[in-house]
Interface confidence: medium
């Protein structure tokens, strides 16, 4: 028998430095948890502890801290080539900056193979891209050799921005010839490595003939056997267990996300590549764990340029960008306006000529806003100031919803209106009426949402059954401010960019701005 | 010069507690590794465990539940503690400078001249 | 754990002969960095050990050019070209390849 170690990460957005446990700016330092410092020691330790080793990442490393804000993917390949990663999956955010952001600072710098057996490169870019990213990639490992093959979501497209000469194909249609390949180069021990989330995970472990094991990412799915250390609940035990349909036992097995754990699986191999065990969990990378002072030097030095960007002015605003909890939490603000606006923006993608766009609506909890703006100030606005309006380092989503979904979250809005409460929906894309005479669960009067499968934008009465594309919050998307209806009815739940970095790069490509307050929330009757 | 000096207690008293301190000079704790190995009278080595520069420690599987090995780097001190003594765990107890660099080498370079523990009622 | 076996258990020299001395492990030492993690130890009467070779066969400083280590996965020989009296003791291999390193059971190296 032949024993391997995966290490694994995915789903990091950008976390290099430590972080609070529910992965946000780390304040009190004994209490931290994750980044890149720690995570080397772990990994270090575990390296010397045992002999076949591989560090895996399943993609999603991009976006969402001002990390990547500002080194745009050049902090990813050098923190990844010093931790030594093996492998790396390429996950829908590494596609935010277009095909050139992924190709100059990570694909060319990094020094592991990147890997994608379902993006097929087309046109102009065949050439350019070629040989920078992989479909599989043989790994010797002591006295053996494994085959990770990759594959990223086709939802790409309509995720983040991969142009139009990337294809993005069906993963197991794509995985398939490319693991026949490996068994042909007699390659027996096969790991998929990818970034498409843990149903289909699932599918690829139970589908594709000759994969052994299946490291995943992009759902932030927390699996573990046993008593879990901090707050994420698990969905399953750690590994998955998958009967494939040739009847082998696949384990399946991702690490939650922001680098908060290292995934651990061991896998016993017997001599002709057949999986005979596998066991381990995920390591909470807690303060117990100390950082490595060299990581954490660079670490250090790195963060001098943030601090700088920070105060630098990225546009100016001509109005007062009222985000006075007085304002956002009781009717229409500009700030709510603002920010929706550049949550559509930021969505925009123009996938087929059927639709202007994929998406056109945005709801957010005015309690989520959490200051204002004064243009007094040579109307500068700068990233310290908008993570000020937004200091929870939260990402603006992508949900499927239906109608109805949305009719019961606009009830949700108002019913106890009045009270100063964070539940009241700032929106975009959206006209909403509210008669607050009625009883609470009866106040939406009128609610029209603004149409995608149209040439020219209008808004249309909201159809209950009609599912609905979404822009919103994560807090939202995962029942926060008491939208339980969101969290339980969502049909489909993809995490987006990080929320300051949508605002700012809207205000830094529009230069000025001028938000009004345009009728987009009214109530009737004369009840307000 | 790299030096490593124990200091035990000489004699212990089965199901007592077991406390070794190695001092070091010439090399810092927060670089280097220091590992721990023992020595049965006229028999062979054993491994015990591993206190990393980074404080990070790898322990045999065996001894797991009762070994724990901590450090103070600033009196370049590292200290051994083994619970629940037996006769068996009679041996000379030696550590070693253990040479690292990041996860390629390591190995025990320079050992202490160890210190002779007798477990005995 | 890996068994280290050394062999022979004891070896008889005179000064100035060749002495091999030879270790197998139960399963290859070869980590997936590359590294190959078997090193030789001498340890003489009352002394603790000394490190001779790490790695298969890089030596230690000061340690001198008659000493020399090879071999691979799981099978490796030490070599003294020729024998001084400062050289006899017990010789241990040992592994660092993976949690827990072990040693071998050591080769008596002594005058005939």
């Known amino acids: 028998a032949w024993e391997l170690t995966i290490l694994h990460t995915n789903d990091v957005h950008s976390r290099l430095e430590q972080t609070s446990e529910d992965s946000s700016k780390c304040v009190n330092a004994s209490r931290c948890m994750g980044g890149v410092a720690r995570l080397f020691t772990k990994v270090q330790q575990i390296r010397r502890a045992e002999p076949n080793v591989l560090l895996l990442d399943a993609g999603d490393q991009y976006q969402g801290t001002i990390w990547f804000t500002v080194y745009k993917g050049a902090e990813v390949a050098h923190f990844m080539n010093a931790l030594r990663y093996d492998a790396m999956a390429l996950g829908n955010h590494e596609f935010d900056n277009g095909v050139e952001g992924l190709i100059e600072p990570l694909l060319k710098e990094a020094k592991f193979p990147i890997l994608s057996a379902n993006i097929k490169a087309k046109g102009p870019l065949a050439s350019q891209i070629s040989g920078l990213y992989l479909p599989y990639k043989v790994l010797p490992v002591g006295d053996e050799v494994v085959g990770i093959v990759g594959y990223t979501s086709k939802e790409t497209p309509f995720l983040s921005n991969p142009g139009t000469n990337l294809v993005f194909e069906d993963e197991i249609t794509a995985l398939q010839p490319e693991v026949d390949k490996l068994k042909t180069l007699n390659v027996n021990k096969i790991i998929a490595l990818g970034h498409s989330g843990f149903e289909m995970d699932k599918l690829i472990a139970q589908k594709v003939r000759g994969v052994d094991v299946v490291v995943g990412g992009h759902s932030n799915t927390f699996l573990y056997t046993g008593n879990p250390p901090s707050k994420e609940v698990p969905a399953g035990k750690y590994p998955f267990i998958v009967t494939s349909d040739d009847g082998r036992k696949v384990p399946v097995v991702q690490a939650y996300a922001f680098g908060k754990y290292l995934g651990y699986l061991k896998i016993e191999f017997d001599e002709r590549g057949n999986v005979i065990s596998s066991h381990g969990n995920p390591i909470l990378l807690n303060s117990s764990i100390p950082e490595d002072p060299s990581i954490k030097a660079d670490i250090n030095k790195w963060r001098i340029k943030l601090d700088n960007y920070s105060t630098q002015e990225l546009g100016k605003t001509i109005v007062y960008l009222d985000g006075s909890s007085q304002s956002c939490r009781f009717r229409e603000c500009n700030m709510g306006n603002l920010i929706c606006d550049a949550m559509i923006n930021n969505n925009l993608r123009h996938t087929d000529e059927m639709f202007w766009n994929h998406v056109s609506m945005c709801i957010l909890n005015g309690g989520g806003i959490r200051s204002p703006i004064d243009e007094r100030n040579n109307g500068t606005i700068t990233w310290e100031n908008l993570a000020a309006v937004l200091p929870f380092g939260g990402t603006f989503d992508l949900v499927q919803l239906k109608g109805s979904t949305l009719k019961k979250a606009f009830e949700h809005s108002v019913h106890r209106y009045g009270q100063s409460t964070g539940e009241f929906l700032q929106v975009g894309g959206i006209h909403v009426v509210y008669d607050l005479s009625r009883k609470p669960g009866d106040r939406v009067v009128k609610l029209d949402v603004l149409c995608t499968k149209c040439r020219v934008p209008s808004y249309d009465p909201l159809k209950m059954d009609e599912v609905y594309k979404v822009i919103l919050p994560n807090f939202l998307a995962n029942g926060g401010d008491g939208f339980q209806m969101i969290k339980d009815e969502l049909l489909r739940h993809d995490s987006g960019d990080q929320d300051i970095n949508v605002v700012s790069t809207y205000i830094s490509k529009m230069k000025v701005i001028y938000p009004a307050v345009e009728g987009r929330i009214k109530f009737s009757t004369g009840s307000h | 010069d790299v030096q490593l000096v124990e200091s035990g207690p000489g004699l212990v008293a089965p199901s007592q507690s077991l406390s070794i301190t190695c001092t070091v000079s010439?090399?810092?704790?927060?670089?280097?590794?220091v590992s721990w190995v023992r020595q049965p009278p006229g028999k062979g080595l054993e491994w015990l465990g591993v206190?990393?520069?980074?404080?990070?420690?790898n322990y045999h599987s065996a001894l797991i539940s009762r070994l724990s090995i901590s450090k103070d780097n600033s009196k370049s001190q590292v200290f051994l503690k083994l619970n629940s003594l037996q006769t068996d765990d009679t041996a000379t107890y030696y550590c070693?400078?253990?040479?690292?660099?990041?996860?390629?080498?390591?190995?025990?370079?320079?050992w202490g001249a160890g210190t002779t523990v007798t477990v005995s009622s | 754990d890996i068994v280290m076996t050394q062999a022979p258990l004891s070896l008889p020299v005179s000064l100035g002969d060749q002495a091999s001395i030879s270790c197998r492990s139960s399963?290859?030492?070869?980590?997936?960095?590359?590294?190959?993690?078997l090193h030789w130890y001498l340890q003489k009467p009352g002394q603790s050990p000394k490190l001779l070779i790490y790695?298969?066969?890089n030596r230690f400083s000061g340690v001198p050019d008659r000493f020399s280590g090879s071999g691979s996965g799981t099978d490796f020989t030490l070599k003294i070209s020729r024998v001084e009296a400062e050289d006899l003791g017990v010789y241990f291999c040992?592994?660092?390849?993976?949690?827990?390193?072990?040693f071998g059971g050591g080769t008596k190296l002594e005058l005939k």
């Open positions: 070693a400078k253990t040479n690292i660099f990041y996860d390629y080498d390591w190995y025990l370079d320079v």
């Open positions: 040992s592994h660092s390849t993976h949690v827990p390193w072990t």
């Open positions: 010439g090399f810092s704790l927060t670089s280097y590794g």
């Open positions: 790695k298969v066969s």
């Open positions: 206190i990393w520069g980074d404080g990070s420690t």
């Open positions: 399963q290859s030492l070869v980590h997936s960095n590359g590294n190959t993690y």
